[in-house]
């Protein structure tokens, strides 16, 4: 889980090892602040929980790509 050390900076100290279906993910944000120990991706799930993930992992990159495309596609 992400940890807000000094709001508004949120950092990730551990990443999930578990691969998660993109269909459980609603959105994401990148953590690139120099105040944080490592770059990270925070996924928000369909039930509004937040998960720290490693942006170097393929499933994380694929999930971000999928969510990007989902955002770009207008709903009919």
């Amino acid at each position: 889980q992400p940890d807000a050390i000094n709001a508004p900076v949120t950092c990730c100290y551990n990443f999930t090892n578990r691969k998660i279906s993109v269909q459980r993910l609603a959105s994401y944000r990148r953590i690139t602040s120099s105040k944080c120990p490592k770059e990270a991706v925070i996924f928000k799930t369909i039930v509004a929980k937040e998960i720290c993930a490693d942006p170097k992992q393929k499933w994380v990159q694929d999930s971000m790509d999928h969510l990007d495309k989902q955002t770009q596609t207008p709903k009919t």
């Epitope: 889980q1 999930t16 090892n17 578990r18 691969k19 998660i20 279906s21 993109v22 269909q23 459980r24 609603a26 799930t45 369909i46 039930v47 929980k49 998960i51 499933w59 989902q70 709903k75």
Partner: antibody, heavy 119, light 113 residues
Framework: QVQLVQSGAEVKKPGASVKVSCKVS????????MHWVRQAPGKGLEWMGG????????IYAQKFQGRVSMTEDTSTDTAYMELSSLRSEDTAVYFC????????????WGQGTLVTVSS | DIVMTQSPDSLAVSLGERATINCKSS????????????LVWYQQRPGQPPKLLIY???TRESGVPDRFSGSGSGTDFTLTISSLQAEDVAVYYC?????????FGQGTKVEIK
């Protein structure tokens, strides 16, 4: 392809504990979210608990809280489910179950382990 | 917790005839942002673990014959076997996977008339 192989049948006395194992191959256990589902004779499927990556921890069905423990040995890629204070109603087949990308349903199942609780 | 209720509890159908199983959830399992229903169907033959048939309410798992189909949205779902075969004798379960705890229907036993 994930494969799950469970330990053999057990007979236990009321009040005892049982520990069922589930050996993973084809994946490492830490990539998967392992869950446990049981089925009493002639009855339906009942989710007991498992690792939920959305919570970052193992979660348990309220019914089993305090009586069940689900653990992992990452060195052997083996998951364990231990149920204590056994009673006759715990007689059931216990399944481990998972999928490659956690979504909340199960496309890989162990073969099942029959636990019989009898005095 | 979301309660899943299946109907009927059992049904007997002639070979080659249609079998229909219903599943109702106590609250919606539709996520409107992706328009997906978080519902699956399993088949369980005697002495075997459950086998995934259908996920996202209507997507057939690979290798599942096309006589099996899933439909419905929100709270009401249906599994249809269009032409019952002898190997389809089993218990069928629905399960919601929107919210934990993950919950199953009580099962529907399908037999040959």
């Amino acid at each position: 392809q994930v494969q799950l192989v469970q330990s053999g049948a057990e007979v236990k006395k009321p009040g005892a504990s049982v520990k069922v194992s589930c050996k993973v191959s084809g994946y490492t256990l830490t990539e998967l979210s392992m869950h446990w589902v049981r089925q009493a004779p002639g009855k339906g499927l009942e989710w007991m608990g498992g690792f939920d990556p959305e919570d970052g921890e193992t979660i348990y069905a309220q019914k089993f809280q305090g009586r069940v423990s689900m653990t992992e040995d990452t060195s052997t890629d083996t998951a364990y489910m231990e149920l204590s204070s056994l009673r006759s109603e715990d007689t059931a087949v216990y399944f481990c179950a998972t999928n490659e990308f956690w979504s909340g349903y199960f496309d890989y199942w162990g073969q099942g382990t029959l636990v019989t609780v009898s005095s | 917790d979301i309660v899943m209720t299946q109907s009927p509890d059992s049904l007997a159908v002639s070979l080659g005839e249609r079998a229909t199983i219903n599943c109702k959830s106590s609250q919606s399992v539709l996520y409107s942002s992706n328009n997906k229903n978080y519902l699956v169907w399993y088949q369980q033959r005697p002495g075997q673990p459950p086998k995934l048939l259908i996920y996202w309410a209507s997507t057939r798992e690979s290798g599942v014959p096309d006589r099996f189909s899933g439909s419905g949205s929100g709270t009401d779902f249906t599994l249809t076997i269009s032409s019952l075969q002898a190997e389809d004798v089993a218990v069928y379960y629905c399960q919601q996977y929107f919210y934990s705890p993950w919950t199953f229907g009580q099962g529907t036993k399908v037999e040959i008339k």
